[in-house]
Interface confidence: low
């Protein structure tokens, strides 16, 4: 089951996924001057069985120099508003992504590909938030946020997180950023 | 709102070339991928191919793959259909379909009917 | 790249509840949760009812649902209305980024 919304916009921090549930879509985008092989996968998809998850498809960028188009990414964030756009970057936690069964580790980079990544995620999904640089984390609440289906709809749990610049009064001085906290951990996917 | 708008029907004879056309309206255009279906008089859809009209990225179902050719003009939001030698057998209704969330064809156009007849 | 396999007929009266079968194979259905099924009513172009196998768009009735299991995917329709009365292709995204279609089934809705 798909995740109907985009995990919550936190101001000034962004957001990643440790590990990718089985039947996430990463959408295969290539950086400007860059498209699609010809044939290649439109998108690559976490599959696998009880013992092994790994990536179906793989992405494949070509330049596109021999055209007078350049490849747009599908879909525009900003025009199809289907999932939220993350941004390339090293993981914020040290979770072991090999040991969690039924999910995919970050699918590594290809040639040529778009700067940022927009993936569809699906019920049971989890990402953490981080302040971004310059910014630091003023609540000591869950940096993480979970989709979940209630009652038929799938909605994204609120992160406890409040980013505010580095010149401001900070409750927890030494705080840089947010930590997962136990309590935070996500209820049964299927609650009613 | 969101809509395809599809050229009118086509009455042709065997061996003649014939170009039809999908216009998007409502909606990015460049932004979403474009399919071809067939459906033949009587009988099932069938998918023919899909293209990215962005930048003319372009797909064909191995059944159609030289059979047809799928093109775009990003400038005017139009997807093409065209055949260089029609044959009696694509008599059939040609729809054109935006491919929006979730690898779902969400929007439909009205469909062309294309009829070949000596 | 074969069509997925649906019965090409079912009926029933109103007030009852079918179910629509489509078999693929492993390269498509049973690959991703990337199947839709569409309505077409007589003389009318295709309209999306359910997509991810049972999700539906805004304006779709709730009667229609989906399930997956394998490599066949089903329709079921409740409450059978006579305005339900169409044919019904499955379609499924495949391993080779392409899209196949069911051959489709024809709904009756006995009077």
């Known amino acids: 089951e798909l995740c109907d919304d985009d995990p919550p916009e936190i101001p000034h921090a962004t957001f990643k996924a440790m590990a990718y549930k089985e039947g996430t879509m990463l959408n295969c985008e290539c950086k400007r001057g860059f498209r699609r092989i010809k044939s290649g996968s439109l998108y690559m998809l976490c599959t696998g069985n009880s013992s092994h998850s790994s990536w179906d498809n793989q992405c494949q960028c070509t330049s596109s120099a021999t055209r007078n188009t350049t490849k747009q990414v599908t879909p525009q964030p900003e025009e199809q508003k289907e999932r939220k756009t993350t941004e390339m970057q090293s993981p914020m936690q040290p979770v072991d992504q090999a040991s969690l069964p039924g999910h995919c580790r970050e699918p590594p980079p290809w040639e040529n590909e778009a700067t940022e990544r927009i993936y569809h995620f699906v019920v049971g999904q989890m990402v953490y938030y981080q302040c971004v640089q310059g910014y630091r984390a003023l609540h000591r609440g869950p940096a993480e946020s979970v989709c979940k289906m209630t009652h038929g709809k799938t909605r994204w749990t609120q992160p406890q997180l409040i980013c505010t610049g580095e010149m401001e009064t900070s409750q927890f001085p030494g705080e840089e950023k947010p930590q997962a906290s136990p309590e935070g951990r996500p209820e049964s996917e299927t609650s009613c | 709102q969101v809509q395809l708008v599809q050229s009118g029907a086509e009455v042709k004879k065997p061996g003649e070339s014939l170009k039809i056309s999908c216009k998007g309206s409502g909606y990015s255009s460049t932004s979403y991928w474009i399919g071809w279906v067939r459906q033949m008089p009587g009988k099932g859809l069938e998918w023919m191919g899909i293209?990215?009209?962005?930048?003319?990225?372009?797909r064909y179902s191995p059944s159609f793959q030289g059979q047809v050719t799928i093109s775009a003009d990003k400038s005017i939001s139009t997807a093409y259909l065209q055949w260089s030698s029609l044959k009696a057998s694509d008599t059939a209704m040609y729809y054109c379909?935006?491919?929006?969330?979730?690898?779902?064809?969400?929007?439909w156009g009205r469909g062309t009917m294309v009829t070949v007849s000596s | 790249q074969s069509a997925l396999t649906q019965p090409a007929s079912v009926s029933a009266s109103p007030g009852q509840s079918i179910t629509i079968s489509c078999t693929g194979t492993?390269?498509?259905?049973?690959?991703?949760?990337?199947v839709s099924w569409y309505q077409q009513l007589s003389g009318k172009p295709p309209k999306l009812i359910l997509y991810?196998?049972?999700k539906r768009p805004s304006g779709i009735s709730d009667r229609f649902s989906g399930s997956k299991s394998g490599n066949t995917a089903s329709l079921t329709i409740s409450g059978l209305q006579a305005d339900d009365e169409a044919d019904y292709y499955c379609s499924s995204y495949t391993r080779s980024s392409t899209w196949v279609f069911g051959g489709g089934t024809q709904l009756t809705v006995l009077g």
């Open positions: 492993s390269s498509d259905v049973g690959a991703y949760i990337y």
């Open positions: 991810d196998v049972s």
């Open positions: 293209i990215y009209p962005g930048d003319s990225d372009t």
């Open positions: 379909a935006r491919l929006g969330s979730y690898a779902a064809f969400d929007i």
